[in-house]
Structure formats: structure tokens, C-alpha cells
């Protein structure tokens, strides 16, 4: 790597993926094995991100770019880029402090990750239940009784729960 | 961008009530336990108060039974914590502290400092 | 009084290895999983530790927990200046219906 020739920062020319070596008479000089720098002119590398344990590589630590994580299959990501894997529960089920625990009664929860919610209340919207709701799926409501005339056979399935989120207690 | 801002922190007399607000944005806050955590002068971190999702059960430290009442508004992405009865061991910095479902605190507020002194 | 109880205090020099203990009852540590946090001065604290030993991303690997019976311990190795903190071990507890913290140790690079 050539000298920088700078009058105000020598360093200010280093590319991403090197480093301006103070000891080398601020030269650029690459980053080492296992860093990475991702912008130009700075004065370190930062050392790659290890997916270990719970987490996996999802992409590799390169001179310009720290990895990236996920988690190993029955987890899923949790925070910002992925800092934390929890575990998946079954449908039906949700992740407490304790462990994955049935929905109660009157909930659901379809996904493998999330909360249950409450079946959705049909009379609300002057409906009635056409299939009853079970741990892992809602409710499907139906016409109410008086709207039922020869002929209609409109099923109107139930408003989307809330954006599955990504969880809670 | 997970982020938890208390305000409503002071300067109270001893007997006296305040009210702290934590405002949440860049998650879902209807779909955690909320907390609050405290931390006196020169001391260690004390539990104070946790809520469900949807409000329907409160969990409280003995430090705050029958005083302290936590209280959320999904609506508004904002959790409470009505303090009556102040003593000068309440003083500290309050901390509101979003639950990850793995029972963990991952994302604090800065904190709001409240003094209670005659 | 704390329902767990650390250690006031621990050091080491730097490079050195350091653990720091926390000792339960069967309603919390024995039952349920164990957190760590660090706290630098001024600051609120962070997550060192999740599940009993579950690092998040960004904690060095110099940090390492674990869990048995009632008790657990936070293991710093490598020990660096950086390092010197308050932490914090904490689990919900059972019969309380609530979390519980450790008294906190205060660790000094000497």
C-alpha cells in the first residue's frame, strides 16, 4: 500500500479494509485476519463478530465487513442484528420467562414465535362462530343466523390479529 | 430503533405522590411485559414492578406494595408508575426496562431521578 | 438485604481470571434462569449474560455463566481495565411473583 500523500489527515486516504498504521509511519496497512474496516481513514479495525453457540454465520467477516448472525434452527433472532436467539415454541403456544406454555383458553397463537391473542369476537361485528377457535387457530366467523337466506353462503374470515410482533412474555 | 424515555422524576416531600412516564417507540409495546427497575445512590438494582401485555396482571417488589401502582396505555405506547406515600428510601433513579419474552432486560431507558426530601 | 446474594467485591489484575458468585434458594436460582448485567458508572446497566449462559452478540467471550442447584457464577477471563464494573446476577423468583437482584459486586483492576 502506497504512502498517503495528504496534507491534513495522511489517514483520510486509507480505504475501507485497511487501517493508517501509526507504528508504520501512518501508512495503510490491511486489516488482520479476523477485522474488518468498513469505512476509509480510520485508525483501527474492528474485530469481526463470532456466530457462536446458539448463533450461526449468515455471512462471512470480510476485510470491508463485519459477519452477520442468525440462529441455529429452533431459534430466532431477537433484537438488533440478531444480538439474541430465543426459542421457537409450537403453534399453540408461546415463550414465557419459563419456558414454552400452552395458549389459555380463548387464545391462539399460529406462529412458531410471538404471543397467543384472543379469538376474535365474532358479535362484534354482528357475526357468529361458524368454526370454533383452537390453541393454534382463530375463530372463523360466519354470517349471523338472521343473514342467512337461501342461497348466501358467505364465509367471512376474521380480521388479521394484531402484526405478529416478535413477542413477549 | 428500540428506545424507552422516563420523564416525571423530582424533587418531593416525604408523604408526597409523583407519577413516572416511560414512553416506548421502535417495538410492538403491546406485545411485552414492561418493568420498572431502581436504583438508589450508591446502590444496587431493586425490582420494583412489572405488567403484562394487556394490563391484566401487575406484579410489584415489596418496596412498592400498597404504594406504588404500575399502569400502562397501549394506545399511547406509554408505561406508568404512580408513586404515592414517598419516603426518603424511594429516592433513586428509576429505570423503565422493556421484558424480552426470555425474561431478560435487554433495553433500559436513561433513567429519571427522583429526591424526596423536606 | 437481597434475596441473592453476591459478593461485595472481587479484583484481579489484568489477565487474569475472576468469578463472581451468586447464591439463590430453590424459588428462584433453583427454578428459573439467571441474568447478568454489568453497570459502568453513570450508566444503565447492560446484559452480559441471558439463560444462565447465553452470551448476546457484542459480549466478549471472556465472559462466561453458569448455573448449579441454587448458586451461579459469572467467570471473567482475560481480565482487562475495561472490565471494571458493577454486575449484577438476577432471577424471577417463584414464591415473590417477582424478579430478584443480587446486592451487585463491585470488580476492581488492580
Known amino acids: 500500500f502506497e504512502r498517503t500523500r495528504s496534507l491534513q489527515d495522511p489517514c483520510s486516504n486509507c480505504p475501507a479494509g485497511t487501517f493508517c498504521d501509526n507504528n508504520r509511519n501512518q501508512i495503510c496497512s490491511p486489516c488482520p485476519p479476523n477485522s474488518f474496516s468498513s469505512a476509509g481513514g480510520q485508525r483501527t479495525c474492528d474485530i469481526c463478530r463470532q456466530c457462536k453457540g446458539v448463533f450461526r454465520t449468515r455471512k462471512e467477516c470480510s476485510s470491508t465487513s463485519n459477519a452477520e448472525c442468525d440462529c441455529t434452527p429452533g431459534f430466532h433472532c431477537l433484537g438488533a442484528g440478531c444480538s439474541m436467539c430465543e426459542q421457537d415454541c409450537k403453534q399453540g403456544q408461546e415463550l414465557t420467562k419459563k419456558g414454552c406454555k400452552d395458549c389459555c383458553f380463548g387464545t391462539f397463537n399460529d406462529q412458531k414465535r410471538g404471543i397467543c391473542r384472543p379469538w376474535t369476537n365474532c358479535s362484534l361485528d354482528g357475526k357468529s362462530v361458524l368454526v370454533n377457535g383452537t390453541k393454534e387457530r382463530d375463530v372463523v366467523c360466519g354470517p349471523s343466523p338472521a343473514d342467512l337466506s337461501p342461497g348466501a353462503s358467505s364465509v367471512t374470515p376474521p380480521a388479521p390479529a394484531r402484526e405478529p410482533g416478535h413477542s413477549p412474555q | 430503533e428500540v428506545q424507552l424515555l422516563e420523564s416525571g422524576g423530582g424533587l418531593v416531600q416525604p408523604g408526597g405522590s409523583l407519577r413516572l412516564s416511560c414512553a416506548a417507540s421502535g417495538f410492538t409495546f403491546s406485545d411485552y411485559y414492561m418493568s420498572w427497575v431502581r436504583q438508589a445512590p450508591g446502590k444496587g438494582l431493586e425490582w420494583v414492578a412489572n405488567i403484562k401485555q394487556d394490563g391484566s396482571e401487575k406484579y410489584y417488589g415489596d418496596s412498592a406494595t400498597g404504594r406504588f401502582t404500575i399502569s400502562r396505555d397501549n394506545s399511547k405506547n406509554t408505561l406508568y408508575l404512580q408513586m404515592n406515600s414517598l419516603r426518603a428510601e424511594d429516592t433513586a433513579v428509576y429505570y423503565c426496562?422493556?421484558?424480552?419474552?426470555?425474561?431478560?432486560?435487554?433495553?433500559w431507558g436513561q433513567g429519571t431521578l427522583v429526591t424526596v426530601s423536606s | 438485604q437481597s434475596v441473592l446474594t453476591q459478593p461485595p467485591s472481587a479484583s484481579g489484575t489484568p489477565g487474569q481470571r475472576v468469578t463472581i458468585s451468586c447464591s439463590g434458594s430453590?424459588?428462584?436460582?433453583?427454578?428459573?434462569?439467571v441474568y447478568w448485567y454489568q453497570q459502568l458508572p453513570g450508566t444503565a446497566p447492560k446484559l452480559l449474560i441471558y439463560?444462565?449462559?447465553q452470551r448476546p452478540s457484542g459480549v466478549p467471550d471472556r465472559f462466561s455463566g453458569s448455573k448449579s442447584g441454587t448458586s451461579a457464577s459469572l467467570a471473567i477471563s482475560g481480565l482487562r481495565s475495561e472490565d471494571e464494573a458493577d454486575y449484577y446476577c438476577a432471577a424471577w423468583d417463584d414464591s415473590l411473583s417477582g424478579w430478584v437482584f443480587g446486592g451487585g459486586t463491585k470488580l476492581t483492576v488492580l
Open positions: 426496562a422493556k421484558e424480552e419474552r426470555i425474561g431478560t432486560y435487554y433495553y
Open positions: 439463560r444462565n449462559n
Open positions: 430453590s424459588s428462584n436460582i433453583g427454578s428459573n434462569y
